[in-house]
């Protein structure tokens, strides 16, 4: 098809050689009056679209992406030729940075519903460069963490070395949707929730005397739990005595709750106290029985093949520990009467 009628957009991806980062291209289809495919959201110029133009009520995920070879060869279908590029709906994800990603990318609807739709396409000229600005050594990462329940911020990596005052107007997207109220180089989050997690894109325009282009960066944002400030607590056993039958097998379970730690080395073990002696018991491995964002519940059992008279004089102690501290719970066996 003839791409001369496609609207054109120039983008710059400046990648850091120190970190893994991704990049995205959106199929920003134009909205000419005649084309019903492109003319998704009927907005006045003053209105800001809640979604990108191609994400209207109809199914707009049906777009085709091509790359235009620099030698003038025919357009190449992205999916067939570029394994490091993934198409997700109307977005093209570049999984690895590199100057070899530079080039012209064209998207257009797969379904051409009218003669007007032929011209409904967008050509993106992408220039990819390694970051050379040594003065900005501490630019924001392309992977940023937000602590759940606290205040946080998401910084645009390509602008994080500039003060808010000198920063140009920034356009932010989250998971492909325009964040219309955000215009600064930093998004401030008053209280962090799970839904703040996602892929953020920040764009700003740079110009010289000849032309202007969009500088884009992609930030993967995770919401994380802060490391616990508490030592683990033992959920079971609750009682410090346990009625047993002599000669019968017995399993005592120790269940403990450990709060989130990024470096997690939980300890849960059983030992036996007999008058002045105490020793650790070789018991089956501990296992996690419940795992949530905030805590991990780990269980470890002690198994006695048969309860003896000697066991009644002993204390069975469950010991649990994390980096903050430890907790113990002891159990004394008592013979069942009757």
């Amino acid at each position: 098809f003839n791409i001369s009628g496609c609207s054109t957009k120039k983008l710059l991806w400046t990648y850091s050689t120190r970190s893994e980062e991704e990049f995205v291209l959106f199929c920003d289809l134009p909205e000419p009056q005649k084309s019903h495919f492109c003319h998704r959201n009927r907005l006045s110029p003053k209105q800001v679209p809640e979604h990108l133009p191609f994400m209207g009520s109809n199914d707009l995920s049906d777009v085709q992406w091509y790359q235009q070879p620099s030698n003038g060869d025919p357009l190449e279908d992205i999916r067939k030729s570029y394994p490091h590029i993934i198409q997700d709906k109307c977005t093209l994800h570049f999984l690895t940075p590199g100057v070899n990603n530079s080039g012209s990318y064209i998207c257009r609807p797969k379904m051409i519903k009218s003669p007007y739709d032929v011209a409904c396409c967008v050509k993106m000229i992408l220039e990819v460069k390694p970051q050379t600005n040594a003065s900005c050594e501490y630019s924001a990462s392309h992977k940023q963490d937000l602590l759940l329940g606290s205040t946080g911020s998401i910084s645009c990596p390509s602008l994080s070395c500039q003060s808010d005052a000198q920063s140009p107007a920034v356009t932010w997207y989250k998971n492909g949707k325009l964040l219309s109220v955000e215009r600064s180089n930093r998004i401030v989050v008053d209280e962090v929730y799970d839904y703040h997690q996602g892929t953020y894109v920040c764009d700003y325009t740079q110009s010289d005397t000849v032309s202007s282009w969009t500088v884009r960066a992609v930030v993967q944002v995770r919401t994380i739990v802060g490391d616990t400030k508490l030592k683990p607590d033992i959920l079971d056993p609750v009682e410090d005595t346990l009625e047993v039958e002599l000669g019968k097998p017995l399993t005592i379970s120790c269940k403990a709750r450990f709060g989130f730690e990024r470096v997690f080395n939980p300890v849960i073990k059983w030992y036996i106290k007999d008058s002045d002696l105490e020793w650790e018991v070789s018991v089956p491995e501990a296992k996690s029985i419940k795992s949530t964002l905030k805590d991990e519940i780990i269980e470890r059992n002690i198994i006695l093949e048969k309860v003896t008279q000697r066991d009644l004089r002993r204390k069975f102690v469950c010991f649990v520990q994390n980096s903050i501290g430890n907790t113990t719970q002891s159990v004394q066996l008592k013979e069942k009467r009757g």
């Epitope: 997690f264 491995e285 296992k287 996690s288 905030k294 991990e296």
Partner: nanobody, 116 residues
Framework: QVQLQESGGGSVQPGGSLRLSCAAS????????MGWFRQAPGKERERVAS???????TYADSVNGRFTIAQDTAKNTLYLQMDSLKPEDTAMYYC??????????WGQGTQVTVSS
């Protein structure tokens, strides 16, 4: 330091079999779930199979009946037996451990290639 190390990948013809192993070290307990994932070129990473501490297993529809996940807790090793392999099973295979509500600990991966 908790670590996972996969092995057993390689090249095989369609219809063939492979057994992947994942050696876990540094864990002081058995995680709630252990899983096998795979990522083919140009595709998102997908969960292939997972196993719970109680031994119950789940499989992706695409591998159900062909792949078997198993765990040897005494050897701290997770396995994936892959039978009746197809070209579409070609991918990098990763072993992962579940911690604090997510698969957070990952191995480096082992490559599986199925072609005639």
């Amino acid at each position: 330091q908790v670590q996972l190390q996969e092995s057993g990948g390689g090249s095989v013809q369609p219809g063939g079999s492979l057994r992947l192993s994942c050696a876990a070290s540094g864990f002081t307990y058995i995680p709630a779930y252990m899983g096998w994932f795979r990522q083919a070129p140009g595709k998102e990473r997908e969960r292939v199979a997972s196993i719970k501490t109680d031994g119950s297993t789940t499989y992706a529809d695409s591998v159900n009946g062909r792949f078997t996940i198993a765990q040897d807790t005494a050897k701290n090793t997770l396995y994936l037996q892959m039978d009746s392999l197809k070209p579409e099973d070609t991918a990098m295979y990763y072993c992962a451990a579940y911690q604090f509500g997510a698969f957070r600990v990952w191995g480096q991966g082992t490559q599986v290639t199925v072609s005639s």
